[in-house]
């Protein structure tokens, strides 16, 4: 898998988890977010080179396609597979809110 | 949506469904298939500028955090939504076989 | 140039529905709440809710609690406000205004033109 | 909920003079060290437009004849050198607690 247990310990030019911290108030001028005050979002980045983690059929076709038509612009992308949810506290007032938001931390890559 | 619909009938620069004929012979190197010669399998290609038709939470985040930090490297990429199977006939031997190959077409795309 | 433009002065019948729509340009329509507040006729300002673009996060004022709903478009960056269950007490000018983007309850800095409802059999 | 109360309910200042308008809340509305109370005028026909940030914080692009002061639950905004172009209705608004309330205004 694409995963930090991989992709943290090899150098790799590959489509590949790689890790990004996002601080809310300065990386997206979200300033009401009480704790955290940022967290390890990740993204996925990376060539998608002949059969490298291919999702889907197509993507594999595209992938083989690639390889016979070096000229050709139509490649798979390294894209998000697994994604967790963050929690997070604020403020409406005086009243505490917790809000847990799907889809916020990417786990593993995958070509697409 | 970006499928056909819009993306065919608009020059877009952003994601989008593009055409991309494949010739199973030519393109692939697969001289067994009998029928079809080839198929629109197209691709999904394009920026994916803030909002952009973004996938998750992540990639909403991910593309604000871009328009925020307009040098950094972490930004969505545009793949394949939806996908659609495409059926083939090729033999073994003498004998015709029918095959329902899953996810072969893509008919949408996303930024994710 | 920061500007907040609302749908059109809407007639409706009691206990009918309206959904008005506020498009915004001119700033990042995920990086700010957005308020939503009514005054009827000759009178003061209601603050009914707001709704976090990004994640359509919501909050609403009791008053209003179980008739209001806030959604919005980030593809569009266009926020909405439905309001059901009309009657005469709906009669009012509707607005939407920016929060400020301090705090999640803040001050509004940039309002919409406004939005006349109408309730009339 | 905190009732905003606004004094007097209207008011009629002549041109050049001073105009103060105070604004008590039903419990103070200050926390972590800020007053989270705020001003607007709404001129006739118009949208209200944010005067004063944090009870005294005077908001980008208007005027400073405009001034607010206060703290815990009694507020004053006060316009210096008054002039017609300052007619409307002023609200004074709270974001300490849930809901966020306003003033009944002062005209």
């Known amino acids: 898998a694409l995963d930090a247990a991989y992709c943290f310990r090899n150098v790799q030019d590959n489509c590949c988890l790689r890790p990004l911290y996002i601080d809310f108030k300065r990386d997206l001028g979200w300033k009401w977010i009480h704790e955290p005050k940022g967290y390890n979002a990740n993204f996925c980045a990376g060539a998608c080179p002949y059969l490298w983690s291919s999702d889907t059929q197509h993507s594999r076709v595209l992938s083989l396609y690639n390889t016979i038509n070096p000229e050709a612009s139509a490649s798979p992308c390294c894209v998000s597979q697994d994604l967790e949810p963050l929690t997070i506290l604020y403020y409406i007032g005086k009243t505490p809110k917790i809000e847990q938001l799907s889809n916020m931390i990417v786990k593993s890559c995958k070509c697409s | 949506a970006l499928d056909a619909a819009y993306c065919f009938r608009n020059v877009q620069d952003n994601c989008c469904l593009r055409p991309l004929y494949i010739d199973f012979k030519r393109d692939l190197g697969w001289k067994w298939i009998h029928e079809p010669k080839g198929y629109n399998a197209n691709f999904c290609a394009g920026a994916c500028p803030y909002l952009w038709s973004s996938d998750t939470q992540h990639s909403r985040v991910l593309s604000l955090y871009n328009t925020i930090n307009p040098e950094a490297s972490a930004s969505p990429c545009c793949v394949s939504q939806d996908l659609e199977p495409l059926t083939i006939l090729y033999y073994i031997g003498k004998t015709p076989k029918i095959e329902q190959l899953s996810n072969m077409i893509v008919k949408s795309c996303k930024c994710s | 140039e920061v500007q907040l433009v609302q749908s059109g002065a809407e007639v409706k019948k009691p206990g009918a529905s309206v959904k008005v729509s506020c498009k915004t340009s001119g700033y990042i329509f995920m990086k700010y709440w957005m308020n939503w507040v009514r005054q009827a006729p000759g009178a003061g300002l209601d603050w009914m809710g707001q709704?976090?673009?990004?994640?359509?996060?919501?909050n609403y004022n009791e008053m209003f609690e179980g008739r209001v709903t806030l959604t919005a478009d980030t593809s569009t960056s266009t926020a909405y406000m439905e309001l059901s269950s009309l009657r005469a007490g709906d009669i009012a000018v509707y607005y939407c205004?920016?929060?400020?983007?301090?705090?999640?309850?803040?001050?509004?800095?940039?309002w919409g033109q406004g939005t006349l409802v109408t309730v009339s059999s | 909920d905190i009732v905003m109360t606004q004094t007097p309910p209207s008011l009629s200042v002549s041109p050049r003079e001073t105009a103060s308008i105070s604004c008590r809340a039903s419990?103070?509305?200050?926390?972590?060290?800020?007053?989270?109370m705020h001003w607007y005028l709404q001129k006739p026909g118009q949208s209200p437009q944010l005067l004063i940030y944090l009870a005294s914080n005077l908001e980008s692009g208007v005027s400073d004849r405009f001034s607010g002061s206060g703290s815990g639950t009694d507020f004053t905004l006060r316009i210096s050198r008054v002039e017609a172009n300052d007619t409307g209705v002023y609200y004074c608004q709270q974001n300490d607690e849930d809901p966020l309330s306003f003033g009944q205004g002062t005209k």
């Open positions: 709704i976090f673009p990004a994640w359509g996060m919501t």
């Open positions: 419990e103070s509305v200050d926390s972590y060290g800020n007053s989270f």
């Open positions: 205004a920016r929060g400020y983007g301090n705090y999640a309850l803040d001050a509004m800095d940039y």
